[in-house]
């Protein structure tokens, strides 16, 4: 209960903090526990106390171990233990889960992302913002005190973020880094009874004789990402697998985000060969989503050959 | 009309892979689409990703895509959710659901859930 993770990179600074906490005025004491050796408090030691922080500066990958602070006050004391990890700096740009602070969700109203940890640190403005390794650069991304914001979140924005600032200590300054997944949530997301787009119900479509035909269910289920939602096409209210006739297929085409948001999906008939039994046969487009089912109606006529004489 | 039987849930380590299954049985010519929902615990059930038969177009929730894969193998009436790169915000008991129509109102079937745990 009264442990805590920390983590941080070689050469970069890191700073902990007692998980157990007391009055300013309470002394704290940190030991490294494999050892029971105590951490000294002289700034100019690499590792050392500071009340409630225990300060790497930098860390490096032989720190790594389980420190012990013991808050005292003159009726109790209070241990608490910090597990520290100090990992190789990557090579490459991929940053490991282990090295993850904690997901942040945003949405199209609420756009911030904390750099974690940075109110451990004395650090000074300007604080760098990173995407998937990349400078965070435009007029949508605003590096504002601790955090960041992204005007207009867009799905797209969704990724890990890393800050990057200076920590300064006695005028000696050393680097931070720390990375965050962020997810887009779509506040405005629901779904609805489906709405066929396309065709109208009870449709005629005009076909060619031993031409091919394509006819297309177009069906809107909501905004946002859609789950268990469905278009399909039924020959005289069987289903196309079923109905054995190879010269019909039906194969799922676009699914489309129109402008206002909408979540659709669209499923191709094609009738290949029409032939004139084909005319006779009732044709029904279904959209279908736990909300219910919609379902249009279409036949098929003969389209009249064009009369080319002048 | 349709039972659902998931497997494939477990412990993993934070940046692990899992694979879950789920086979269905019963009236599956009536099944339109599948899908994963997950619950972790004092939260509500939330999507995680569906597929219908023809399977281009899977949908995914943001908090996994490009980290989970579904996919349906419909020979054997059984989808899949390929979890990479799992996150301790992962776990959460997964149940696989369907979009079930035979004529009337369109329902849901749901399995009874396997656990997935992601924790160092």
């Known amino acids: 209960k009264f442990s805590k993770q920390s983590w941080g990179l070689e050469n970069e600074a890191l700073i902990v903090r007692c998980p157990r906490q007391g009055k300013p005025s309470y002394t704290v004491d940190w030991y490294y526990s494999q050892t029971n050796k105590s951490i000294p408090t002289q700034e100019r030691n690499r590792v050392f106390a500071s009340g409630q922080l225990l300060k790497f500066l930098p860390a490096a990958v032989a720190d790594s171990g389980i420190y012990t602070c013991i808050v005292r006050s003159p009726t109790f004391n209070r241990t608490g233990y910090a597990n520290v990890t100090i990992y190789k700096k990557q090579s490459d740009c991929n940053v490991p889960d282990y090295l993850m602070y904690s997901t942040v969700s945003g949405s199209e109203k609420n756009s911030k992302i904390y750099c974690p940890t940075i109110d451990l640190y004395n650090w000074t403005a300007p604080l760098e913002w990173f995407k998937n390794c990349q400078a965070l650069q435009g007029s949508r991304y605003r590096a504002h005190k601790s955090f960041l914001v992204i005007d207009n979140v867009m799905t797209e924005d969704a990724g890990d973020y890393t800050c990057k600032f200076i920590h300064n200590e006695n005028g000696a300054n050393y680097s931070v880094t720390a990375t965050r997944s962020f997810t887009v949530k779509d506040e405005q997301g629901f779904s609805l009874f489906p709405v066929i787009g396309a065709p109208a119900q009870n449709e005629i479509k005009e076909v060619e004789i031993g031409k091919n035909a394509n006819l297309t269910c177009s069906a809107c289920f909501g905004k946002g990402t859609q789950f268990l939602a469905a278009v399909l096409w039924q020959l005289n209210g069987t289903k196309i697998t079923d109905f054995g006739e190879p010269r019909i297929q039906q194969e799922e085409g676009q699914n489309q985000s129109f402008s206002n948001g909408l979540a659709c999906l669209d499923m191709v008939l094609r009738i290949a060969d029409v032939k004139e039994e084909d005319l006779l046969l009732q044709y029904d487009c279904l959209a279908l989503n736990l909300h219910g089912l919609r379902r249009h109606t279409v036949r098929l006529s003969r389209k009249n050959p064009i009369d080319h004489h002048s | 009309e349709v039972q659902l039987v998931e497997s494939g849930g477990g412990l993993v380590q934070p940046g692990g892979s899992l694979r879950l299954s789920c086979a269905a049985s019963g009236r599956t010519s009536n099944i339109y689409a599948m899908g994963w929902f997950r619950q972790a615990p004092g939260k509500e059930r939330e999507p995680v990703a569906s597929?219908?038969?023809?399977?281009?177009?899977?949908a995914y929730a943001d908090s996994v895509k490009g980290r989970f894969t579904i996919s349906a193998d419909n020979s054997k009436n059984t989808a899949y959710l390929q979890m990479n790169s799992l996150k301790p915000e992962d776990t959460a008991v997964y149940y696989c659901s369907t979009l079930y129509y035979s004529g009337l109102d369109p329902v849901d079937y749901w399995g009874q859930g396997t656990l997935v745990t992601v924790s160092s």
């Open positions: 597929i219908t038969p023809g399977g281009r177009f899977p």
